[in-house]
């Protein structure tokens, strides 16, 4: 019986050009985690494997950093990064647990642009 639960950062937002940490935590189970996959919709972003460590998909290597912990850091965000992200925990003996995070990447506000280029 699968007793565990995945806690995630839920719905989050970040600014275009910035970075964000995607974080999931598996709790309420003594199942041992053997691998964690991170995916954006159907695209695999990264894998953290018990034996092999981290593997970042080649197409995301420049913008995805492993960690902290089993989390994932997305950098140089674009509006196209808006969408659903999934953490998939492969465990023994329970099986697979999946957590969902929705990320919205926002254009920088006009006010902030104004402040940034203000003449002293």
């Amino acid at each position: 019986m699968m007793t565990g639960t995945i806690e995630t950062t839920g719905n989050i937002s970040a600014e275009k050009g910035g970075s964000i940490i995607l974080q999931c935590h598996l709790s309420s189970t003594t199942a041992q985690v053997t691998q964690v996959n991170w995916a954006q919709q159907d695209q695999l972003l990264a894998i953290c494997n018990a034996d092999l460590g981290w593997h970042i998909s080649p197409s995301f290597k420049d913008r995805v950093a492993p960690g902290p912990g089993l989390g994932l850091t997305l950098q140089s965000l674009t509006v196209n990064d808006t969408g659903e992200y999934f953490c998939i925990y492969h465990t023994y003996p329970d099986g697979t647990y999946t957590g969902r995070i929705f990320l919205e990447v926002l254009e920088s506000s006009v006010a902030e642009h104004g402040a940034r280029f203000q003449i002293p």
Partner: antibody
Framework: EVQLVESGGGLVKPGGSLKLSCAAS????????MSWVRQTPEKRLEWVAY????????YYPDTVKGRFTISRDNAKNTLYLQMSSLKSEDTAIYYC????????????WGQGTTLTVSS | DIVMSQSPSSLAVSVGEKVTMTCKSS????????????LAWYQQKPGQSPKLLIY???TRESGVPDRFTGSGSGTDFTLTISSVKAEDLAVYYC?????????FGGGTKLEIK
């Protein structure tokens, strides 16, 4: 160089309480899971508590569940073990040990601190 | 709980001899999805804390001399020291990290003749 230094051991009466500490240095403490493992006077090794990297998950064997509490302060690079309702069979050397994420063996151990439970 | 049994409990050998010690688990430590055996070996020298030698049953930890070899799968595991040195005087423990609670064998004490 990885260093784990335990402290807080001593002589306690049965039913008493004690808190052990483990100061970590030489590595990114918050990136590792941690455990406490004890060695009995008969030299047997027993795992007694586990905490995940961010402190979200803790696990204990039935022998100490409800009596021992593991915690960590990642800002201070310190691991703790709060022990209560102590019994004579808890007498042991207590080691803190580091675990790589998703790997549950112990890759570094401290030098240990001794707990004696006796009236 | 998984019970780990080690044999012999002690043995005495001369420097240069080959040594084999065994560790048996009460259930398989092989995880089918990654074909890894969740077993580690530790060395504890007199007055010191345990030191990791082998993990995944056969992977030598960085810095461990190649005279130490781990083998086996499922429930039967072996630690071999190909040519014993005086500094190998220690107690050797196996540990399963396949499932909670993690458990250790009782140890094999290696003495030098």
């Amino acid at each position: 160089e990885v260093q784990l230094v335990e402290s807080g051991g001593g002589l306690v009466k049965p039913g008493g309480s004690l808190k052990l500490s483990c100061a970590a240095s030489g590595f990114a403490f918050s990136d590792y899971d941690m455990s406490w493992v004890r060695q009995t006077p008969e030299k047997r090794l027993e795992w007694v508590a586990y905490i995940s990297d961010g402190g979200y998950n803790t696990y204990y064997p039935d022998t100490v569940k409800g009596r021992f509490t593991i915690s960590r302060d990642n800002a201070k690079n310190t691991l703790y073990l709060q022990m209560s309702s102590l019994k004579s069979e808890d007498t042991a050397i207590y080691y803190c040990a580091r675990q790589i994420l998703l790997r549950y063996y112990f890759d570094y151990w401290g030098q240990g601190t001794t707990l004696t439970v006796s009236s | 709980d998984i019970v780990m049994s080690q044999s012999p409990s002690s043995l005495a050998v001369s420097v240069g001899e080959k040594v084999t010690m065994t560790c048996k688990s009460s259930q398989s430590l092989l995880y089918s999805s990654n074909q890894k055996n969740y077993l580690a070996w530790y060395q504890q020298k007199p007055g010191q804390s345990p030191k990791l030698l082998i993990y995944w049953a056969s992977t030598r930890e960085s810095g461990v001399p190649d005279r130490f070899t781990g083998s086996g799968s499922g429930t039967d595991f072996t630690l071999t020291i190909s040519s014993v040195k005086a500094e190998d005087l220690a107690v050797y423990y196996c540990q399963q990290y396949h499932s909670y609670p993690w458990t250790f064998g009782g140890g094999t004490k290696l003495e030098i003749k």
